[in-house]
């Protein structure tokens, strides 16, 4: 399906307010620091030339690729190597290395300020004075922020943006109208960025036999009733969406997955009853939806599955003739009857059904070797089992706080190397599947909490590739991503780590923490217990306890004095002292 | 363990031809993507062409229009044909599988197996 002018192909497919906000967010994930003011320049050439293009598609470099158009702009920004280093050594290569360069500078932690919410009545004002350029604000301050945000989702919260500001900005009340929106999709969208990055680390760093692999499992828990076929177009429909996306290719990205949405809303019976809801509604919510859909129930009639996998004598044969095929379908089979297990524990017991074939299916009798392979699944499946009964237990004994303060305890006497700010971070997310998953029925909690830390971890995993501190982080994160998660869980105290040495500066405390939010607080106190841990890493639980609860006191005593910073400077060395003498 | 063997480099003149083939050890091969790359002298190892396992091909700008990979999975070999060879196609040529099949195709961490390389020389 050639075009003889891509840009214009995709300017006409995607209409123009797709195509600007689509090229603002690629330039804004590529030059993550460039000023608003210069991506909005950069779109609005580009979207120009596109103009020309689909006027006469035999004009001047309409034939030229997408990369070579997009890369030959960004490389027009005059400040690239003051601002970037050695990015601007892309612009001194070909396509597709250059394009393929720029991806590989995307800062998944750009050293950009935090964004600070004006007052709603600052926000409604600048609304309505240019609500192009207040969306469009919003588009670049989330893409450069979160370089591999997935494009045509972003689209969708910069759709539902505009529609919370348009609804509030004339109620009564605005700001208990707006707030409680523009908290929803902050969280929506640190959680959608969270999981497109997995997904194209996992594209990138295991290929895209995992993301397959992956997309089977998930595919088939939602689509019980399609059948492997069906299953198997929408995964490499799917995989070629996400590898686009992920590849920086945002225009084609969009344009293939409006495609896979029209496809599964013209075959909804051949998928399933669980998506009709979604097909009446408008593109980018449609998508939204098709991707956010409920599992449809499981066939009533599926028979055992060692019939074909355990009992055959033909496994091995069925195996030989298409190995990715045969397995493929045992992943689908297991999967669609097992919405209760979690995708990444579906894809542990495919990986050692596959290689009890291959030991089996070279041996003498093969059918009395692999005969007790489903016996082996047993263990797998009760390791996530048991974690997530235990944490689960332990969330509704602690609470939330307690909770990721204990995680961050384990996670620093394990990891002691990390950046205290990304063990923080981390072992905070970590820490919210237990209201995120705790409270579901048995039958949901492993896929919610299991596949949430596998985005967790993968975030752990990004940050440490860029600053890589810890050999156990760089092993866990590498050997195989279905694994991650139990390779984190088996890691024991550091024996080999040297102590930080103590700090009295990290420990020392001022008046401003008074005036900080709750959360900034915690942020404040989980960063002391880090500090603490990393330099007694043998401290137990109790020890850690009275030393936080002596903190927690002091801190409010000396925000109820009348002369806050005297006594900050008057209890701190007391309470250091005391903190030192307690875990002496 | 894949091995990959190199064949075809070597002397030819500007503007003349090469077929350079790399053979596979494992019937996988024609489950993995392939690629050529290519060091000169004193320069870093540049991405020349891929091949997707269903086919697909991409190739670096300068070498677009006169460089063809392709491949055969009955023979578990990889192809790629050098027309209108130039002086600074000078390199030693290198064959990559990666089993897992990548997305990033031009970088070079994203292959499993390397060959040991060819010589092509193009003297004026």
């Known amino acids: 399906d050639t075009h003889k002018s891509e840009v214009a192909h995709r300017f006409k497919d995607l209409g123009e307010e797709h195509f600007k906000g689509l090229v603002l967010v690629a330039f804004s994930q590529y030059l993550q620091q460039c000023p608003f003011e210069e991506h909005v320049k950069l779109v609005n050439e580009v979207t120009e030339f596109a103009k020309t293009c689909v006027a006469d598609e035999s004009a001047e470099n309409c034939d030229k690729s997408l990369h070579t158009l997009f890369g030959d702009k960004l490389c027009t920004v005059a400040t690239l190597r003051e601002t970037y280093g050695e990015m601007a050594d892309c612009c001194a290569k070909q396509e597709p290395e250059r394009n393929e360069c720029f991806l590989q500078h995307k800062d998944d932690n750009p050293n950009l300020p935090p964004l600070v919410r004006p007052e709603v009545d600052v926000m409604c004002t600048a609304f309505h004075d240019n609500e192009a350029t207040f969306l469009k604000k919003y588009l670049y301050e989330v893409a450069r922020r979160h370089p591999y945000f997935y494009a045509p989702e972003l689209l969708f919260f910069a759709a539902r943006y505009k529609a919370a500001f348009a609804e509030c900005c004339q109620a009564a009340d605005k700001a208990a109208c707006l707030l409680p929106k523009l908290d929803e999709l902050r969280d929506e969208g640190k959680a959608s960025s969270a999981k497109q990055r997995l997904k194209c680390a996992s594209l990138q760093k295991f290929g895209d036999r995992a993301f397959k692999a992956w997309a089977v499992a998930r595919l088939s828990q939602k689509f019980p009733k399609a059948e492997f076929a069906e299953v198997s177009k929408l995964v490499t429909d799917l995989t070629k969406v996400h590898t686009e996306c992920c590849h920086g290719d945002l225009l084609e990205c969009a344009d293939d997955r409006a495609d896979l949405a029209k496809y599964m809303c013209e075959n909804q019976d051949s998928i399933s009853s669980k998506l009709k809801e979604c097909c009446d509604k408008p593109l980018l919510e449609k998508s939204h939806c098709l991707a956010e859909v409920e599992n449809d129930e499981m066939p009533a009639d599926l028979p055992s599955l060692a019939a074909d996998y355990v009992e055959s004598k033909d496994v091995c044969k069925n195996y030989a003739e298409a190995k990715d095929v045969f397995l493929g379908m045992f992943l689908y089979e297991y999967a669609r009857r097992h919405p209760d297990y979690s995708v990444m524990l579906l894809l542990r017991l495919a990986k050692a059904y596959e290689a009890t074939l291959e030991k089996c299916c070279a041996a003498a009798d093969p059918h009395e070797c692999y005969a007790k392979v489903f016996d082996e699944f047993q263990p797998l499946v009760e390791e996530p089992q048991n974690l997530v009964k235990q944490n689960c237990e332990l969330f509704e004994q602690l609470g939330e706080y307690k909770f990721q303060n204990a995680l961050l305890v384990r996670y620093t006497k394990k990891v002691p190397q990390v950046s205290t700010p990304t063990l923080v971070e981390v072992s905070r997310n970590l820490g919210k599947v237990g209201a995120k998953c705790c409270k579901l029925p048995e039958a949901k909690r492993m896929p919610c909490a299991e596949d949430y830390l596998s985005v967790v971890l993968n975030r752990l995993c990004v940050l440490h590739e860029k600053t890589p501190v810890s050999e156990k982080v760089t092993k866990c994160c590498t050997e195989s991503l279905v694994n991650r998660r139990p390779c984190f869980s088996a890691l024991e105290l550091d024996e080999a780590y040297v102590p930080k040495a103590f700090n009295a500066e990290t420990f020392t405390f001022h008046a401003d923490m008074c005036t900080l939010s709750e959360k900034e607080k915690q942020v404040k106190k989980q960063t002391a217990l880090v500090e603490l841990v990393k330099h007694k890493p043998k401290a137990t639980k109790e020890q850690l306890k009275g030393v936080m609860d002596n903190f927690a006191a002091f801190v409010e005593k000396c925000c109820k004095a009348d002369d806050k910073e005297a006594c900050f400077a008057e209890e701190g060395p007391k309470f250091v002292a005391a903190s030192q003498a307690a875990l002496a | 363990q894949v091995q990959l063997v190199e064949s075809g480099g070597g002397l030819v003149q500007a503007g003349g031809s090469l077929r350079l083939s790399c053979a596979a050890s494992?019937?996988?091969?024609?489950?993995?993507?392939m690629a050529w790359f290519r060091q000169a002298p004193g320069k870093e190892r540049e991405f020349v062409a891929h091949i997707h396992w269903r086919g697909s091909t991409t190739y670096l700008d300068s070498v677009k229009g006169r460089f063809t990979i392709s491949r055969d999975n009955a023979k578990n070999t990889v192809y790629l044909q050098m027309n209108g060879l130039r002086l600074e196609d000078t390199a030693v040529y290198y064959c990559?599988?990666?089993?897992?099949?990548?997305?990033?195709?031009?970088?070079?961490?994203?292959?499993?197996?390397w060959g040991q390389g060819t010589q092509v020389t193009v003297s004026s």
């Open positions: 494992e019937r996988a091969f024609s489950h993995s993507n």
């Open positions: 990559a599988a990666d089993s897992a099949r990548r997305i990033l195709v031009t970088v070079s961490t994203s292959y499993d197996y």
